[in-house]
Structure formats: structure tokens, C-alpha cells
Interface confidence: medium
């Protein structure tokens, strides 16, 4: 038997396998920004370099005395979780420790920034193989700490951060809220969110995925053969840093976007009980527990997508929400969601050379979310086609008119504030393949892409009876790229993607006043990438 | 994920009336001051001055030096603790909060963030 956490994240077929880079050497280096560590511990001895970097505040209290084993406790444990020879995820990975937390586990934003700069300097002085930076710390939201993470990520460094142990929205903390870091929440042996006293793991749209973070056995700094159990999102982040190190060890050229997409795609889905999270955060929090993915050679050229939620727009009449993909990803579709149902839709626009997903609040609305579907599409060429709103009573049709371009997503944006005019047209013409069909007063946006072997199809599911939501899933081998509520019943809350499932949400009150003829339809656009084939639309 | 969270942003765009320095009076601050929303986590007196992305190495040093000079004219001693060149242009400074208005009006300054605590998780 092995510890539960290792069993959980490393599938059986990986257990004995050694991860080696193509040239036979494992040159991945993990930088740990934490407390001091006990480098002589048998778990990490010989694989850890304790740098001379030290940027910590003074300990509080006049009676505080530094006890080496206490000072080293947090960092030693995490170093062991990442690369410990018995209890580590990426056994044998080289680790460099930078001291940015004092003996009480406290540091500063400035000290962390100087630590990140130290890593960048090291990288410039002596370029090496892939670098992973583990940030098992959190403070309040910091624009500069997030910016520094962004700059470092753009140099090819992979940053992994703890979501935070405050039982709160991770977006309120840094570096957890930085989009360029892989932010990790904590789960226990039952795959449930970790409770820590009165608090627990953070959650929300800034969390990328969860990993084991409760009662994790690892190196204890009390003696060089001692082990201890610790809990927290630091431990969870250390697991993901170890997974990333193993992925990079096998395939050193994987980019941050590829790593994140693969972590999400191969994670264990829907095992977390979402009721633990506040109601307004449940839809935003990923139900994903990390596992070590197979190599790309084993899985072929799958189309990988993830859902990115914007921040809440706020309630003002013209409030907009913006969701962005990572620079390497393609924005294949954009939808929106509002708890009150008062929204004026969504669209894709270019800002500073990057396509972004926007959503607009409506008068009397409590605010909206923009929901972007961000995908890795090699050699893609995507564009947006839009048609202004049609005259009353008419539908608007938009299709991809460029040769070999396929429809990957549709967006609808209403110019009018009056929600009552946005009813389903009395007669809806049969949708033509590869078209977005709008309705009264709606501007329609079609996301059209050309990529080698990309093929897409629409899958719809309608429910006439009372239902809070309608779902439609893409079948195995296909990936959900677009998700919409079709013109639909009065007052839909919007639509969003959860893994390969398209969810269309309907307002409770809308269920009562709907006539039997008005079906709420969830429309999914499902695509796959078959590198040998030509781009095509599947009917 | 990139929007500012529960975060304090204060505009200190006060034109200088303290002395007749032409270049200073001409430059009205568009930079913002930011600090942690959790008061207990703040470290007043230490500030990260973040400069515009394209600021050159020499300009970073000049800006830090200019702040020291102008603070000295007002009878304040400030200490530049660190200069950031490699990840972003900026510097870490220990100074009185009285000087924030002055610092925000310096050329090249994009924003100033008060230092704050981070914690092991």
C-alpha cells in the first residue's frame, strides 16, 4: 500500500514508471518559496539546493526564540511532498529552496517579489531545463504580485500556487488570483473540500483544480528520518507542482497552457460535494481533483478546452464582464450567465490584439458573468462574424462563409433593454448546419475557425416541462467548444460549459409561466481534431 | 481572474502646491495607490513603486533617486531597499506615507502598492 494521497493522484499504470526526459536526464527544477528547510532529511537529501536567498520579516513578539525544527517545518514538508524519495510525487526532482517565510510562516509581498526576481536572474545567468515555481503562500489581493507572476510565466516558468486556507473566494488573495499561475485548492481522502478548524480551502473561479491537502504524510524537520502529517492548500499545490515536474520530465517542451489544459482534462471529475461551497460560488468552482496525466504520445492530438469565468460585472446598468483566455489559447465561444436572468447577452471582441468574451448586464439585473471556452487548437485561424439585430419578427442567421472554416461557438447580444421582446419567435425555421440562429432584436456572433482536421457538429436538447436546467453533452472523442440557450423560453439565466457538458439555466419563475410549446433548448457545439482530415462540419 | 479583487485603490492625484518646482507641478498624478483590503495584513511605511512597463534601467534608478531628492527637500529621509529590473521596473522604498502624493506624481510611475504580509498555507 502507499499513502492515500499518492494513490489518488498517480494512476496505477504510473506507479512504478520512472519519468525521464528524452535524453535520459531529468532536468526539471522546482523552486520552492517558503520557510527554511532541513536539507539533510533523508527524504530530500542530495536533491535539494538551499540557496542563499533569504528575505523575511522579523518574527513577532519579544519572547520568540527560533527553534530550527519549527522554523523548517513547513518548507521541509513541502519539499518532501514534491520530491521526497519515499513520500514524494516526483521522487528525485531537483529542488531549490528560497526562504521568503519566517519561523512563524510569515513573509511579505516585497520579499516574495524579490524571490521571484531572484529566480528570473538565475534563469538569465544560467539557462536550464524547465522550471516550476511553487508558491505555498497567500496574502491579500496584490496587483504587483500577480503582475510579477505574469511576467515570470511569460518567460516559460510554470507557477503553482496555494488557493489559500481562508474558506473564501481565492480571487481575493494573491498569488492565487493571478491567471497565469495554476491555483490549487485542497481535498481530503474522501475527495471533499478540506476543512481546517473554522476555515478551509478557498474556492471559486480563480481555482484551477483541487488536489490532496488533508493529513498528508511527508518529511518532518524534527529529525532526518521523521515524518509528519500536515494539511492545507500548500500541500495540495505541492502535489500539483510534483505532477507538473513529472509531466515536464517526460515532455520538457510542454507549455503552461498545455500543462494546465492537460491537468484539467485528465483530472477526476465530479467527485467533490459542491454543497460545501457557498451557493453563489458552486457554479464557479471546478469539480476537479488532480491526477498525473498520460504523456501526449499516449493520448494523441486531442482537442483540449477549459471554461474560464469572468469576475462578476456588478449590478450597474451598463456593467460588463470580461473573460480572457491565455495567450496561447483560442477563444472558441462566449456565453453569459446571470442569477437574476437580467442580461443583455454576450459577444466576442478584440482588445489589444486578443479576442475576449464580454457579457452585458441589463437594467435591474444583479450582474452577469462572461463565460469563455478556451481551447488549444494547433495552427488555428479563427475569426468572428456578426450580424446586427434583425427587424421585429425575423430571425438572424450567421454562418461561417470562409472556405474550410467551421462554427465553434455562437453569441447573442440584445440591443434592447426590454426583456419581454426577447421571446422565442413564433416560427423558428429549421437551423441550417453551421449556423447561429438569433431572434428578435439580437445581434448574432459566430465564432469560425480553420485548423487542420477540425470538425464540429451541433447537438441540441430541449425540455418543454418545468426544469431548472437543460443539459447536453458531447460524446466521447468530441470536445465541447460552444454552449448556448437557444432563443428559448422567457428569462433564461444563460448557459455555461462544465467539462464536456453544456448547461442551460432557466429562472424558477420562468418555469411557471411557460406554455407547453416553448421548449428551453441547450445547444452544444462539439468539435474534434483529426489531424489527417480536412476541416468540416458534421451534420 | 485578473480583475482587482477586494482591494483598496486610492487616487492621490493632487497637483503639487508645496513648492515651485516646474516639472513637478506640471506632472499631475495619474498613478494610483493600492493597499491590502485586510488592515491587519498591511505594512505601512514600506511601498513598492511600480513603473511603466517600458521604463529603462537607467530611468528606474533616476526615478528612485528623484524621489529621494524631493523627499529630502521636504525634510524626509527615505530608504530605497531594492530596485527591480528583471521582472518589472520598480523599486521598494521605506518612507513616510506623507510622501505618497509626491511619489505618485513622479514620471514613469504606474502605481504604488503598500507592502503587506503573506502567510504559509
Amino acid at each position: 500500500s502507499i499513502p492515500w494521497n499518492l494513490e489518488r493522484i498517480i494512476p496505477a499504470w504510473h506507479q512504478t514508471e520512472e519519468d525521464r526526459s528524452p535524453d535520459g536526464s531529468s532536468q526539471v527544477e522546482v523552486y520552492l518559496l517558503d520557510t527554511s528547510i532541513q536539507g539533510a532529511h533523508r527524504e530530500i537529501e542530495g536533491r535539494v539546493t538551499i540557496t542563499d536567498f533569504n528575505s523575511v520579516p522579523e518574527e513577532d513578539g519579544t519572547r520568540f526564540h527560533r527553534q530550527a525544527s519549527k522554523c523548517d517545518s513547513h518548507g521541509t514538508h513541502l519539499a518532501g511532498v514534491v520530491s521526497g524519495r519515499d513520500a514524494g510525487v516526483a521522487k528525485g526532482t531537483s529542488l531549490h529552496s528560497l526562504r521568503v517565510l519566517n519561523c512563524q510562516g510569515k513573509g511579505t509581498v516585497s520579499g516574495t517579489l524579490i524571490g521571484l526576481e531572484f529566480i528570473r536572474k538565475s534563469q538569465l545567468i544560467q539557462p536550464s531545463g524547465p522550471l516550476v515555481v511553487l508558491l505555498p503562500l497567500a496574502g491579500g489581493y496584490s496587483r504587483i504580485l500577480n503582475a510579477a507572476c505574469r511576467h515570470l510565466a511569460r518567460t516559460g516558468v510554470v507557477l503553482v500556487a496555494a488557493a489559500g486556507n481562508f474558506r473564501d473566494d481565492a480571487c481575493l488573495y494573491s498569488p492565487a488570483s493571478a491567471p497565469e499561475v495554476i491555483t490549487v485548492g485542497a481535498t481530503n481522502a474522501q475527495d471533499q473540500p478540506v476543512t481546517l478548524g473554522t476555515l478551509g480551502t478557498n474556492f471559486g473561479r480563480c481555482v484551477d483544480l483541487f488536489a490532496p491537502g488533508k493529513d498528508i504524510i511527508g518529511a518532518s524537520s524534527d529529525c532526518s528520518t521523521c515524518f509528519m502529517s500536515q494539511s492545507g492548500t500548500s500541500q495540495a499545490a505541492a502535489h500539483v507542482a510534483g505532477i507538473v515536474a513529472r509531466m515536464l520530465s517526460r515532455e520538457p517542451t510542454l507549455t503552461l497552457a498545455e500543462l494546465r489544459q492537460r491537468l484539467i482534462h485528465f483530472s477526476t471529475k465530479d467527485v467533490i460535494n459542491m454543497a460545501w461551497f457557498p451557493e453563489d460560488q458552486q457554479v464557479l468552482t471546478p469539480n476537479l481533483v488532480a491526477t498525473l496525466p498520460p504523456s501526449t504520445h499516449e493520448t494523441g492530438g486531442q482537442l483540449l478546452c477549459r471554461t474560464v469565468w469572468s469576475a462578476h460585472s456588478g449590478p450597474t446598468r451598463t456593467a460588463t464582464a470580461t473573460a480572457r483566455c491565455a495567450p496561447e489559447e483560442e477563444l472558441l465561444s462566449c456565453s453569459s450567465f446571470s442569477r437574476s436572468g437580467r442580461r443583455r447577452g454576450d459577444w466576442i471582441e478584440a482588445i489589444g490584439g486578443q479576442q475576449v468574451c464580454k457579457a452585458l448586464n441589463a437594467f435591474g439585473g444583479e450582474g452577469v458573468y462572461a463565460v469563455a471556452r478556451c481551447c488549444l487548437v494547433p495552427r488555428a485561424n479563427c475569426s468572428i462574424h456578426n450580424t446586427p439585430a434583425a427587424r421585429a419578427g425575423l430571425e438572424t442567421h450567421v454562418h461561417c462563409h470562409q472556405k474550410d472554416h467551421v462554427l465553434t461557438g455562437c453569441s447573442f447580444h440584445w440591443e434592447v433593454e426590454d426583456l419581454s421582446v426577447r421571446r422565442q419567435p413564433a416560427l423558428r425555421s429549421r437551423r441550417q448546419p453551421g449556423q447561429c440562429v438569433g431572434h428578435q432584436a439580437a445581434s448574432v456572433y459566430a465564432s469560425c475557425c480553420h485548423a487542420p482536421g477540425l470538425e464540429c457538429k451541433i447537438k441540441e436538447h430541449g425540455i418543454s416541462g418545468p426544469s431548472e436546467q437543460v443539459t447536453v453533452a458531447c460524446e466521447a472523442g468530441w470536445t465541447l467548444t460552444g454552449c448556448n440557450v437557444l432563443p428559448g423560453a422567457s428569462l433564461t439565466l444563460g448557459a455555461y460549459s462544465v467539462d464536456n457538458l453544456c448547461v442551460a439555466r432557466v429562472h424558477d419563475t420562468a418555469r411557471a409561466d411557460r406554455t407547453s410549446g416553448e421548449a428551453t433548448v441547450a445547444a452544444a457545439i462539439c468539435c474534434r481534431s483529426r489531424p489527417s482530415a480536412k476541416a468540416s462540419w458534421v451534420q | 481572474q485578473d480583475e482587482d479583487g477586494d482591494y483598496e485603490e486610492l487616487m492621490l492625484a493632487l497637483p503639487s502646491q508645496e513648492d515651485g518646482l516646474a516639472d513637478e507641478a506640471a506632472h499631475v498624478a495619474t498613478a494610483t495607490f493600492r493597499r491590502c483590503s485586510k488592515e491587519a495584513w498591511r505594512l505601512p511605511g514600506t511601498y513598492i513603486v511600480v513603473l511603466m512597463e517600458e521604463t529603462q534601467r537607467l530611468q528606474i534608478e533616476q526615478t528612485a533617486h528623484r524621489l529621494q531628492t524631493r523627499a529630502a527637500r521636504r525634510g524626509y529621509v527615505i530608504k530605497v531597499l531594492h530596485i527591480f529590473y528583471d521582472l518589472f521596473p520598480g523599486f521598494l522604498v521605506k518612507m513616510s506615507s506623507d510622501l505618497l502624493g509626491l511619489a505618485l506624481k513622479l514620471p514613469h510611475v504606474e502605481y504604488i502598492e503598500e507592502d503587506s504580509f503573506v502567510f504559509a498555507q
Epitope: 500500500s1 533523508r42 532526518s224 528520518t225 521523521c226 515524518f227 509528519m228 | -
Partner: antibody
């Protein structure tokens, strides 16, 4: 008091493998780790490796890595040591020994001290490797 | 690996003598050291653990001291049953034993 009873003496050919068992009685088997220590004729003691119940995995001395496998069967309270690719230098008395692993609370966490302190020993098993 | 060096490798003493055996570690091991006694044809027996703590059932004439790299086992008044081989063993890293000290009758 835990008693450790080992399997009987073995004579093996070079290149073959040997598997020695060690059965515990009295006390809880899984709450303590088992190590294997050998002693060549007229020589000192040499630790080969041990089972760590906290991690549920075995640790091996560098010298024996890849050649020794230590396992434990909780249902029968028995530990095993298998040594492969035997050579004449492996002729020795092989002892199993219970080592301590103590759990204490510290800084609000549990610390497991993996004390390689051998208080109970088996009677020893002589393995002779000869062609 | 941490090397343990015992001295002397053998000594001759009489009943009632005070006997001291030393053990030196190749690097600091705090107080992670145990002492064992082994008689011919028998398994070793734990005498002292953690450098200086007497194992229950062991006579009080046995004592241990030291920390870091230098350790000492002392038998305050040698008894006939104490003639045996004594081993030190560190557990700060993977366990390693000293080469042994044989205490013989003079």
C-alpha cells in the same frame, strides 16, 4: 511484549533468491515497523531496509537497492525479506527487528518519529549461499 | 551514508572495572544514537537509546552520553555477564552500525 519468530535456515545456490519470514505475536503488528539486519560470519551488523507503516512503503539501504524486497502481510502479522541474485558474500544470519515509530502532537500536527531503535529481535535465520 | 567508528575494536577488562567505549559519527547526528550488546549466537539486545536513555530492564551500571558526533557507552562496574560485543547505531539517517567493540576477560 512483541515476540518475533523467523523461518528456518536456508541453503541456496548463487544467482537464486531467498525469502525469509518473520511472524510477530503479542502487540499490534501494524503499529510498528519491521527492519531487516544481517550479520556475516564474524562481522558486524548491517541494516538492509525496513517497512514504514506510516507511509505503507519499504525503505532500503543503498547497497541493497534493487536486490532486496521487504513486504508485510497484516492479516498474518508476518513480514518478509526477499534477497535476489544471491552470491557467496550474502552468507549471513538475517535478523528481523521491530523498530519504533512514535506519533506525537507537535505545533498542532502529528509528528511520526521513525526511530530506527531495535528493541525486539527475531532469533535470526542463517542463509548459506554455496554452489 | 553516515559512517560510525567505534574505538577500541576490542578491550580486555576485569570484573568490577569501569569500561568506556566511544563512537564517532562522520557527521552530526544530534542524539540519534543507540547502543546494543550481542553475545555469541544470539540476537543483539538494546541497552541505550537516544544517546543516553536506558532501555527498560537494563541494569543501571550501563550509561550513555554525548551528542552531535561523539558518544560514549560506560559500564560503571563490569559484571561477568557483560562480556560481549557492543555496537553503536545511528538513526539520524538510514541506520548504520559501528564495527563493534569486543569486551573480553583479562
Amino acid at each position: 511484549q512483541v515476540q518475533l519468530v523467523q523461518s528456518g535456515a536456508e541453503v541456496k545456490k548463487p544467482g537464486s533468491s531467498v525469502k525469509v519470514s518473520c511472524k510477530a505475536s503479542g502487540g499490534t503488528f501494524n503499529s510498528h515497523a519491521i527492519s531487516w539486519v544481517r550479520q556475516a560470519p564474524g562481522q558486524g551488523l548491517e541494516w538492509m531496509g525496513g517497512i514504514n507503516p506510516i507511509l505503507g512503503i519499504a525503505n532500503y539501504a543503498q547497497k541493497f537497492q534493487g536486490r532486496v524486497t521487504i513486504t508485510a502481510d497484516e492479516s498474518t502479522s508476518t513480514a518478509y525479506m526477499e534477497l535476489s541474485s544471491l552470491r557467496s558474500e550474502d552468507t549471513a544470519v538475517y535478523y528481523c527487528a521491530r523498530h519504533y515509530e512514535i506519533q506525537i502532537g507537535r505545533y498542532g500536527m502529528n509528528v511520526y518519529y521513525l526511530m530506527y531503535r531495535f528493541a525486539s529481535w527475531g532469533q535470526g535465520t542463517l542463509v548459506t549461499v554455496s554452489s | 551514508d553516515i559512517q560510525m567508528t567505534q574505538s577500541p575494536s576490542s578491550l580486555s577488562a576485569s570484573v568490577g572495572d569501569r569500561v568506556t567505549i566511544t563512537c564517532r559519527a562522520s557527521q552530526g547526528i544530534r542524539s540519534a544514537l543507540n547502543w546494543y550488546q550481542q553475545k555469541p549466537g544470539k540476537a543483539p539486545k538494546l541497552l541505550i537509546y537516544n544517546g543516553s536513555t536506558l532501555q527498560s530492564g537494563v541494569p543501571s551500571r550501563f550509561s550513555g552520553s554525548g551528542s552531535g558526533t561523539d558518544f560514549t557507552l560506560t559500564i560503571s562496574s563490569l559484571q561477568p555477564e557483560d562480556f560481549a560485543v557492543y555496537y553503536c547505531q545511528q538513526f539520524d539517517g538510514d541506520p548504520t552500525f559501528g564495527q563493534g567493540t569486543k569486551v573480553e576477560i583479562k
